[in-house]
């Protein structure tokens, strides 16, 4: 398996009750607006063929996509949560900027691409779904990167 380097976040990032609560509130509010319950973006298949030690790098890719292609374009919605959660997630993304894996990451890019394609195919409802799964993104980042 490729070796991951600098793929670590301090546990304290996930031990801030206020921003954790706001992230989960944002996810809950968006999930109420998500009428497509058959599709799951962050689930088992996202990690198919990806070893546990590579998953922080994978989640970094998912986080960056979510910020750039979902949260920034939808930043005027789901206030006041969005204006607090987006900077928090952006800081996590910045802290993972040096997270890379040495070697082939095609299997990871393939899984991330499937998630991207699903969001794009669903259009705005895909973006709402991604926001509704920010709790899963948060928990997966915590599990993968601490």
């Amino acid at each position: 398996a490729p070796i991951s380097s600098h793929c670590r976040l301090d546990k304290s990032n996930f031990q801030q009750p206020y921003i954790t609560n706001r992230t989960f509130m944002l996810a809950k509010e968006a999930s109420l607006a998500d009428n497509n319950t058959d599709v799951r973006l962050i689930g088992e298949k996202l990690f198919h063929g990806v070893s546990m030690s590579e998953r922080c790098y994978l989640m970094k890719q998912v986080l960056n996509f979510t910020l750039e292609e979902v949260l920034f374009p939808q930043s005027d919605r789901f206030q006041p949560y969005m204006q607090e959660v987006v900077p928090f997630l952006a800081r996590l993304s910045n802290r993972l900027s040096t997270c890379h894996i040495e070697g082939d990451d095609l299997h990871i890019q393939r899984n991330v691409q499937k998630l991207k394609d699903t969001v794009k195919k669903l259009g705005e409802s895909g973006e709402i779904k991604a926001i509704g799964e920010l709790d899963l993104l948060f928990m997966s980042l915590r599990n993968a990167c601490i």
Epitope: G43, M52, R55, S140
Partner: antibody, heavy 120, light 107 residues
């Protein structure tokens, strides 16, 4: 309460196919993976394969050519079929559920196991 | 495949003793090691995963430590119900592999 129960014939003849069923309750097969693990008498545990929550399968390459894992979600059952068995396949066979979607390779809940003997 | 080597294969101890079991991986598995307890006639029980995370319901006398290739399971004060066989498992990559087990017996 999460429960898994293995069932199947306790005796199989050499060269035949071993067929086992894992019946689950307390969770949905479309939400969690189910793994098969076996244990030879007095020995360690050996991972055989996995049924993913979406119906895909993954196998230990040691068994790939003769192992098939399938499921029937309406009956909450996952099946294991191991073909061309020999005495070396005599073991206790377990099914186990993954912890969650992230810790999918951690086996959080196990059945009690069913003993299979391969003998003529 | 990653080979998991447990030691000792058996250990005798008394109630109240502190017991340590070790597990060594043939290549790095980061922190991704699980410990299971096996008792005759009972379903196997997940105790610890990710090296040190206690599964819900695992008593606090159990603890796990280690990373990369070397890991330990410690029982701080043995209770009568702890006499069993313990297995380590790497849950980093496929195929999932287990140690050969450590039998904890009453002295």
């Amino acid at each position: 309460e999460v429960q898994l129960q293995e069932s199947g014939p306790g005796l199989v003849k050499p060269s035949q196919t071993l067929s086992l069923t894992c019946t689950v309750s307390g969770f949905s097969l479309t939400s969690y993976s189910v793994h098969w693990v076996r244990q030879h008498s007095g020995k360690g545990l050996e991972w055989m394969g996995r049924m993913w929550s979406d119906g895909d399968t993954s196998y230990n390459t040691a068994f790939t050519s003769r192992l098939t894992i399938s499921r029937d979600t309406s009956k909450s059952q996952v099946s294991l079929k191991l073909s061309s068995v020999t005495a070396a396949d005599t073991a206790v066979y377990y099914c186990a559920r993954s912890l969650d979607f992230y810790y999918d390779t951690t086996l959080a809940f196990w059945g009690q196991g069913t003993t299979v003997t391969v003998s003529s | 495949d990653i080979v998991m080597t447990q030691s000792p294969s058996s250990v005798s101890a008394s109630v109240g003793d502190r017991v340590t079991i070790t597990c060594k991986a043939s290549k790095t598995i980061s922190k991704y090691l699980a410990w299971y307890q096996q008792k005759p006639g009972k379903a196997n029980k997940l105790l610890i995963y990710s090296g040190s995370t206690l599964q819900s319901g695992t008593p606090s006398r159990f603890s796990g430590s280690g990373s990369s290739t070397d890991f330990t399971l410690t029982i701080s004060s043995l209770q009568p119900e702890d006499f069993a066989t313990y297995y380590c498992q790497q849950h980093n990559e496929y195929p999932l592999t287990f140690g050969q087990g450590t039998k904890l017996e009453i002295k």
